[in-house]
Interface confidence: low
């Protein structure tokens, strides 16, 4: 843009410029190109010699411009077309600044201090005849001169004329300057342009409220020489918190946030959460719901999921081995990272849950205890003749520490005992013989417990390698046996089990089998009271 | 598929407030960056903006008009309404609502909806 | 309030000719991101506008290649490269860059 420092046309009264001598320059009113009243000033003294009358502007001050441009429009009287000026007449005239720190007054123009500078020597690229003046064909010049640049706080304008026919009908001055404006929500102050042969003018940004730029590199730009702003370089972005909205940035409204500069607009709150306040950098979870540390600001808001569904368990117990299953909880809470996790407690036989500890080192869990992302696991090396009590607890990245100990769980409930109570070392074989063999085992059952006097033993035996069909059955209601009638230096295979009798005897299993040979004819009997 | 309707009485008297609907489908105005807005054609001539809303509810008025127009938004039902208050023969005109997307500006628009002011 | 300025004001034109509007606004339209917020539409007989070219010179979805747009600071240009039946309408700039948004006055182009 231009910054007019001084439009002649602008000036409804008289301009009041210093003309020297009096009968030189001349104020007049006239109008311009559109017919608006203008003042003008006129010299016209092409009969006489030596001519040199001045006319000065009254101070102009320079403001924040170095290089002035000034724009004259005039009209000039062709000197072939006055009569008897052949010798006197002239078709140019002169003009000069005169820099000041302050207004000369109306002294005479070349008595300044300092001398005036000329500009340039202006001559009409159209003069007029009598004919045009007659047919009033004013034709207009206009003619642009470009000082400085300039240090002092202003100046004086000064035109000589020495002889010619001339109307100054406008003398514009004005310096070209980008305008203050805002680009990439950065501020740029109003800057004066240099010269067309200078380099660009960079000039910093200030980034707007609320906005922020790159740490170290504020927003540039370059004010070229004809006051056009070029060459961005970089831009502010809305702070966390705002968006952009034209040239300024304005806080999220609640229900909307935004986390980081780098995003241009503001965003709803992701479910489960909430931003009650304006300028919002995140949204609050809202209760029970929660993000784990990994989770962005982006994220929905998530909650611990329900208990597994559908547990189910099978139970061998030959050997000893405790199979879970389960289905997903019906509430993942919304996230995808949902793992299980196992707490094995042993009880009582009888008696309240609450005489439950934890099951200890003994008991091991595949294919791990924790962190589990199989819906199945196997509990093996538990105790015969126990209760235990499983819990499969379902977590995810918002499940507390203490998530596991909580209510997400599902649990079973299984008795071991008393079938096979026995690892396969707690059967001592007692006594071979050629055709006898004496075993015996703790009782799965402490003595004098309830239920402790109703356990019967069942022991199945067979030759080894002949069908496992093929065997053959004592029982008794002590935890010993003596097998008669065997055959000599044979291996055979027994197993035991014990129940208390009724219905559910079918149900239980057999212990680990053991091997014994019996004695060939020549041999005595052996007593081996260590265990088998 | 985007679309845009106005509905709204044809027919108001001077002095009376004239209040426009405009329903929309096909986007959501709780989606950044998505605007709704208004503008009118009296018979046979140019456009006028009228006002804007946008989906923060952030509001603009054509400062020629501001004393006299209200817009506002109702997010769940997908609708935006337009009041206009001292109707006059002049402001007979057809009226259309358009939306404004980011970075097209206003890129769909209604089918219009003439509304004349005699009384 | 800027004032979009078009010509002409109608355009007769040969079907498979060219055809050119100019829009002019009385302030740069260039806004403090970079981007120049001047839109063309067009509105066919009885019908609401549509738009055919966003932010000077991005056809939008579904308009035919031979509209093209132009321009920068206060003068833009749409062009047709080969004028069809179904083209003829009025012609409209849309600034969007300062509030009040303003339309140009229309431009109005016929079939010959």
């Known amino acids: 843009e231009e910054v007019i420092l001084l439009d002649s046309k602008a000036s409804q009264a008289e301009l009041g410029w210093t003309a020297l001598p009096s009968n030189g320059w001349e104020e007049i009113s006239g109008v311009d190109e559109h017919d608006r009243p203008i003042r003008t000033y006129q010299v016209c003294n092409v009969l006489e010699p030596n001519q040199d009358n001045w006319l000065q502007t009254g101070w102009i001050s320079r403001g924040r411009g170095q290089r002035i441009f000034v724009e004259l429009q005039f009209t000039l009287r062709d000197c072939s077309s006055i009569p008897g000026a052949a010798g006197t007449c002239k078709e140019t005239f002169n003009v000069y600044y005169l820099e000041t720190e302050a207004d000369l007054g109306r002294g005479r123009p070349r008595l300044g201090g300092s001398r005036p500078r000329k500009i340039d020597t202006i001559a009409a690229d159209e003069s007029f005849t009598q004919g045009d003046l007659g047919e009033r064909k004013m034709k207009l010049n206009t003619e642009v001169r470009e000082i400085g640049p300039l240090s002092r706080r202003g100046f004086h304008l000064a035109f000589q004329d020495v002889g010619a026919c001339v109307a100054l009908v406008s003398v514009r001055v004005y310096y070209k300057q980008c305008r203050a404006t805002v680009r990439g929500l950065a501020t740029f102050p109003a800057t004066a342009a240099e010269s067309a042969f200078s380099t660009l003018v960079e000039v910093a940004g200030t980034c707007v409220a609320h906005s922020e730029g790159e740490p170290g590199s504020p927003p540039r730009m370059h004010c070229g020489a004809d006051g056009e702003w070029l060459v961005p370089v970089g831009r502010c972005s809305c702070s966390a918190g705002f968006q952009e909205r034209g040239d300024f940035c304005e806080a999220c409204p609640p229900g909307f946030y935004k986390v980081s500069p780098r995003r241009p607009l503001c965003s709803p709150c992701p479910e489960h959460s909430r931003a009650l306040e304006n300028a919002s950098t995140f949204c609050v979870c809202q209760d029970s719901y929660a993000r784990s540390p990994t989770d962005p600001p982006s994220a929905s808001c998530t909650r611990p999921p329900s208990a597994p569904r559908d547990l189910q368990y099978s139970l061998s117990r030959s050997p000893l081995v405790l199979r879970l299953r389960w289905l997903p909880p019906a509430d993942s809470g919304g996230r995808s990272d949902v793992t299980y996790s196992l707490l094995c407690l042993r009880c009582g036989r009888e008696g309240p849950a609450g005489a439950c500890e934890p099951c200890g080192p003994r008991v091991a869990f595949l294919p791990r205890q924790a962190g589990l992302r199989e819906r199945a696991a196997t509990l093996l090396h538990l105790r015969p003749g126990a209760r235990y009590t499983v819990r499969v607890a379902a977590l995810n990245g918002v499940s507390g520490p203490a998530a596991a100990a909580g209510t997400t769980y599902a649990q079973v409930t299984v008795s071991t005992g008393p079938g096979a109570p026995w690892e396969e070392d707690e059967i001592r074989r007692d006594r071979v013989e050629p055709q006898s063999v004496s075993l015996s085992w703790r009782e799965p059952i402490p003595a004098g417990a309830p239920g402790a006097n109703d356990t019967e033993y069942e022991i199945r035996y067979y030759e080894k390698g002949q069908s496992e069909q093929t065997y053959s059955m004592v029982k008794t209601g002590a935890p010993t046996v003596t097998v008669t009638n065997l055959k000599p230096a044979t291996r055979y295979v027994f197993q035991i089990r014990a129940a208390s009798p009724g219905p559910s005897w079918e149900a239980q299993s057999f212990n680990p089998s053991i091997e014994v040979q019996t004695l060939g004819e020549a041999a005595s009997g052996s007593r081996d009271q260590s265990p088998a | 598929q985007v679309t845009l309707k106005e509905s709204g009485p044809t027919l108001v008297k001077p002095t009376q407030t004239l209040t426009l609907t405009c329903t929309f489908s096909g986007f959501s105005l709780s989606t950044s960056g998505m605007g709704v807005g208004w503008i009118r054609q009296p018979p046979g001539k140019a456009l006028e903006w009228l006002a804007h809303?946008?989906?923060?509810?952030?509001?603009r008025y054509n400062p020629a008009l501001k004393s006299r127009l209200t817009i506002t938004k109702d997010t769940s039902k997908n609708q935006v309404v337009l009041t206009m208050t001292n109707m006059d023969p002049v402001d007979t005109a057809t009226y259309y609502c358009?939306?404004?997307?980011?970075?097209?500006?206003?890129?769909?628009w209604g089918q219009g909806t003439l509304v004349t002011v005699s009384s | 309030d800027i004032v979009m300025t078009q010509t002409p004001l109608s355009l007769s034109v040969t079907p498979g000719q060219p055809a050119s509007i100019s829009c002019r606004s009385s302030?740069?339209?260039?806004?403090?991101?970079?981007?120049?917020?001047l839109n063309w539409y067009l509105q066919k007989p009885g019908q609401s506008p549509q738009l055919l070219i966003y932010r000077v010179s991005n056809r939008f979805s579904g308009v035919p290649d031979r509209f093209s747009g132009s321009g920068s600071g206060t003068d833009f240009t749409l062009k047709i490269s080969r004028v069809e039946a179904e083209d003829v309408g009025v012609y409209y700039c849309?600034?969007?860059?300062?509030?009040?948004?303003?339309f140009g006055q229309g431009t109005k182009l016929e079939i010959k």
């Open positions: 809303i946008w989906w923060d509810d952030v509001k």
């Open positions: 358009a939306r404004t997307s980011f970075p097209a500006g206003v890129d769909y």
């Open positions: 302030q740069s339209l260039q806004n403090s991101n970079g981007n120049t917020r």
């Open positions: 849309l600034q969007e860059t300062h509030v009040p948004f303003t």
